[in-house]
């Protein structure tokens, strides 16, 4: 089993390992599959991909059958199998079977802390970001330990590249000093920022 | 002489399952992907599905997904095709061919009746 | 989905005769993927022609079969009683794979 690694967003080149002269593609099937469903196949020099695939796939039959996916989705994760089948006395014979695995990586950055003073109040807000992850993350807010509660936390996720934005805002009051930490997971991944408030000087030291 | 002999007809209460099985001979089914086909009665050819007995890889036809569940057991060389939740517009005769240019070989086919 | 039409969906001609089967593709596909089968009532469905115009095994000459792209004919040049059958075309060149809806022959 072959393994390819890619960041989402990014092309990824699965090769079937195999290759067959034009002369022979008229006595030839072959079928990409991604566990057990259908991604491309061909028959006989007929082309076609399924809806999932269509725009973004690009057959390569000169460079061993190789299927080339654009923009990288996370669903694009797994086990894909190439199978090619020739034509020999009165049937299609397995001449062929590779199978493939391609991880798609979409880590989060270091979420941004951006923070506003709330007018005629000892009140400041901080608000927490980022976006371009998977899976889908959980924000949490932390001082010396223990989490506290956001104002709101919004998640969303962008249908077309699959990938996920989180913004969380937090009130905090500004006459003590305060260390914050910003925590998204996702998967078993992690990232964070840490939001530092000095009252003697009345500015904010972030993390970086 | 490649044949391929269907279980017999059955007659089925709707809601209920059927499964009929697909043996050939002169022929190992795990080197050949086996179709199944339906046809409801005075009605046209249909196909359902397929399935690569080596790996148990199956294709359908969406309208079948859900309905046909396609499997094979090399061990006996047998393909089969189960048809759950059973409904009268199931009533059909279904066959079993050979993965080929085209089907040159098809089970003798096997009806099957969903009456209450 | 590729759909497949047939026409006529049935017609009576006399021993004989010259027939022809017309199959119109709703997308276009190698001629290589392109089949047709004769069946009789109760019986499976029999190869005739595949790849558009090579006759299956044991099929008389007087079947033919012709077209490209998106327009296919069978032909049967001198109208047998035994060709009284329902005649389908069906493409391989894309899942789902379909047939035609079927040409019912029948002798005056």
């Known amino acids: 089993v072959i393994h390819v690694t890619k960041e989402v967003k990014e092309v990824a080149t699965l090769s079937c390992g195999h290759n067959v002269s034009v002369e022979e593609l008229a006595q030839t099937r072959i079928y990409w599959q991604k566990e057990k469903k259908m991604v491309l196949t061909m028959m006989s020099g007929d082309m076609n991909i399924w809806p999932e695939y269509k725009n973004r796939t690009i057959f390569d039959i000169t460079n061993n059958l190789s299927i080339v996916i654009l923009a990288l989705r996370p669903s694009d994760e797994g086990t894909y199998e190439c199978v090619v089948l020739k034509y020999e006395k009165d049937a299609f014979k397995r001449e062929h079977l590779a199978e493939v695995t391609l991880s798609v990586k979409a880590d989060f950055p270091t979420p941004s802390i951006s923070d506003f003073e709330i007018p005629t109040s000892n009140i400041r807000r901080i608000i927490c970001s980022t976006s371009g992850g998977f899976p889908e993350p959980h924000l949490s807010w932390l001082e010396n330990g223990e989490e506290l509660n956001a104002i709101n936390t919004t998640v969303s996720q962008d249908p077309e590249t699959e990938l996920y934005a989180v913004s969380s805002k937090l009130d905090f009051n500004m006459t003590t000093n305060h260390s914050f930490m910003c925590l998204i997971k996702y998967g078993h991944l992690r990232v964070n920022q840490t939001f530092n408030w000095n009252t003697t000087k009345q500015e904010h030291f972030p993390d970086n | 002489e490649v044949q391929l002999v269907q279980s017999g007809a059955e007659v089925k209460k709707p809601g209920a399952s059927v499964k009929v099985s697909c043996k050939p001979s002169g022929f190992n089914i795990k080197d050949y992907y086996m179709h199944w086909v339906r046809q409801a009665p005075g009605q046209g050819l249909e196909w359902i599905g397929w399935?690569?007995?080596?790996?148990?890889?199956?294709l359908y036809d969406p309208k079948f997904q859900g309905k046909a569940t396609i499997t094979a057991d090399t061990s006996t060389s047998t393909a089969y095709m189960e048809l759950s939740s059973l409904r009268s517009e199931d009533t059909a005769v279904y066959y079993c061919?050979?993965?080929?240019?085209?089907?040159?070989?098809w089970g003798q086919g096997t009806l099957v009746t969903v009456s209450s | 989905d590729i759909q497949m039409t047939q026409s006529p969906s049935s017609l009576s001609a006399s021993v004989g005769d010259r027939v022809t089967i017309t199959c119109s593709v709703s997308s276009s596909i190698s001629s290589s993927n392109l089949h047709w089968y004769q069946q009789k009532p109760g019986k499976a469905p029999k190869p005739l022609i595949y790849g558009t115009s090579n006759l299956a095994s044991g099929v008389p000459s007087r079947f033919s079969g012709s077209g490209s792209g998106t327009d296919y004919t069978l032909t049967i040049s001198s109208l047998q009683p035994e060709d009284v059958a329902t005649y389908y075309c069906?493409?391989?060149?894309?899942?789902?794979?379909?047939f035609g809806q079927g040409t019912k022959v029948e002798i005056k």
């Open positions: 061919a050979r993965e080929g240019l085209f089907f040159a070989y």
């Open positions: 069906q493409q391989w060149s894309s899942y789902p794979l379909t």
């Open positions: 399935i690569d007995p080596e790996n148990g890889n199956t």
